[in-house]
């Protein structure tokens, strides 16, 4: 590993999805038809783009982004109605900085309610809390700009779940690209 | 040179509560998670607490949980360990740490004998 | 009892290979990083390798980390008298919120 750790190789904390199918790895089956289809990846904790060969493979399959995220994502539909309300900037943009307890090495993000402006980081990878961001973009679509031009930014965001750590769950919202199994 | 020193240990009475420190000169702890780890006589090492640098994040073994409350004073570059309703298998030596990214700093420990 | 697991002792002689082994889970070795400390009898211990397979400066190469699925291993080649200690992982642990140590091995230089 670099020193910019992969998340599926982290000491990064997970959060359970809402159906153990969502569990399962993507299965693309052994026909040869080429299907794009979305499964839930446990590890980024988002869903994700796979090819599906059209036959077989198992219910971690959604033959679209949104259904598998009402699916597999807590608190989805919930954020995505706040989302698209209006520009209220989540809660979670005003946490102070937390790399959290652990000798990971991430580079992160966060929102700096002082400048009002997303600067980078380095997380610990566990613990923490969800002022936390793999990407510039991500940031500032959420807690910079909430609601300005594409509007769903805070579609792929988890509610926080009510653990014994001071602000809540994990901060894993990732935006990965294609993470085939 | 970065040294971590550990006081606060001794004998006491099953029930009874103790109070680490864990002093640290020669680095500024602000921006660092500090632990506590602790080995028993004759034992492994068993991690016990940890705090993040802005105290926001606070871990616990399941065994201590409930009893042992861990703070830190960033101001006078110090990490502590409340350990109350003490218990005979929490006697162990103790440990300060510090896991940076590429290294540590560990203290050389202070003893806590719990018994009647 | 801990939930990573290492054989309780491991032996060699001056100049062999040893291997040690740490065995886990998912919700430990298999999604975190492990580190790997030396502890030299009455001593603190002391970092050998950290998020798998780096090396802090001042450990010899020597000594080396690598992790596959849900277990982890440290590799001491070229075995000196000076190795004899035991050996910890250690690794986040996502169920129990937790850092949790290996069992810890013995490794003796025999001859």
């Known amino acids: 590993l670099s020193e910019e750790a992969d998340d599926t190789d982290s000491e990064l904390g997970s959060m359970k999805p809402l159906h153990t199918f969502c569990a399962m790895k993507a299965d693309d089956g052994p026909c040869k038809a080429m299907i794009r289809s979305y499964f839930f990846n446990m590890y980024t904790h988002q869903c994700e783009e796979f090819i599906y060969g059209g036959c077989e493979g198992n219910e971690n399959r959604f033959d679209t982004l949104e259904e598998c995220k009402k699916t597999c994502i807590p608190g989805y539909e919930k954020t995505a109605v706040k989302a698209a309300s209006g520009a209220e900037r989540p809660d979670f943009c005003f946490l102070e900085e937390d790399p959290g307890l652990c000798r990971g090495y991430m580079k992160r993000y966060l929102y700096n309610n002082q400048t009002k402006q997303c600067e980078r980081f380095v997380y610990g990878g566990c613990l923490g809390n969800r002022n936390n961001f793999e990407t510039l973009d991500e940031c500032k679509k959420i807690c910079e700009n909430p609601g300005g031009g594409s509007g769903g930014g805070l579609n792929d965001i988890f509610e926080a779940q009510k653990i014994e750590w001071h602000e809540g769950g994990p901060p894993h919202h990732h935006h990965h690209h294609h993470h085939h199994h | 040179e970065v040294q971590l020193v550990e006081s606060g240990g001794g004998l006491v009475q099953p029930g009874r509560s103790l109070r680490l420190s864990c002093a640290v000169s020669g680095l500024t702890i602000d921006n660092y998670a500090m632990q506590w780890v602790r080995q028993a006589p004759g034992k492994g090492l068993e991690w016990v607490s940890g705090?993040?640098?802005?105290?926001?994040?606070?871990g616990y073994a399941d065994s201590v949980k409930g009893r042992f409350t861990i703070s830190r004073d960033n101001a006078k570059n110090s990490l502590y360990l409340q350990m109350n309703s003490l218990r005979a298998e929490d006697t162990a030596l103790y440990y300060c740490?510090?896991?940076?990214?590429?290294?540590?700093?560990w203290g050389q420990g202070t003893l806590v004998t719990v018994s009647s | 009892q801990s939930v990573l697991t290492q054989p309780p002792s491991a032996s060699g002689t001056p100049g062999q290979r040893v291997t040690i082994s740490c065995s886990g889970s998912?919700?430990?070795?298999?999604?975190?990083?492990v580190h790997w400390y030396q502890q030299l009898p009455g001593t603190a211990p002391k970092l050998l390798i950290y998020r798998n397979n780096h090396r802090p400066s001042g450990v010899p190469d020597r000594f080396s980390g690598s992790k596959s699925g849900t277990s982890a291993s440290l590799a001491i080649s070229g075995l000196r008298s000076e190795d004899e200690a035991d050996y910890y992982c250690?690794?986040?642990?996502?169920?129990?919120?937790?850092?949790?140590f290996g069992t810890g091995t013995k490794v003796t230089v025999l001859g």
């Open positions: 250690l690794a986040w642990d996502d169920t129990l919120r937790a850092y949790v």
């Open positions: 998912t919700s430990n070795i298999g999604t975190m990083y």
């Open positions: 740490a510090i896991f940076l990214h590429e290294s540590d700093y």
């Open positions: 705090i993040s640098g802005n105290s926001r994040s606070i």
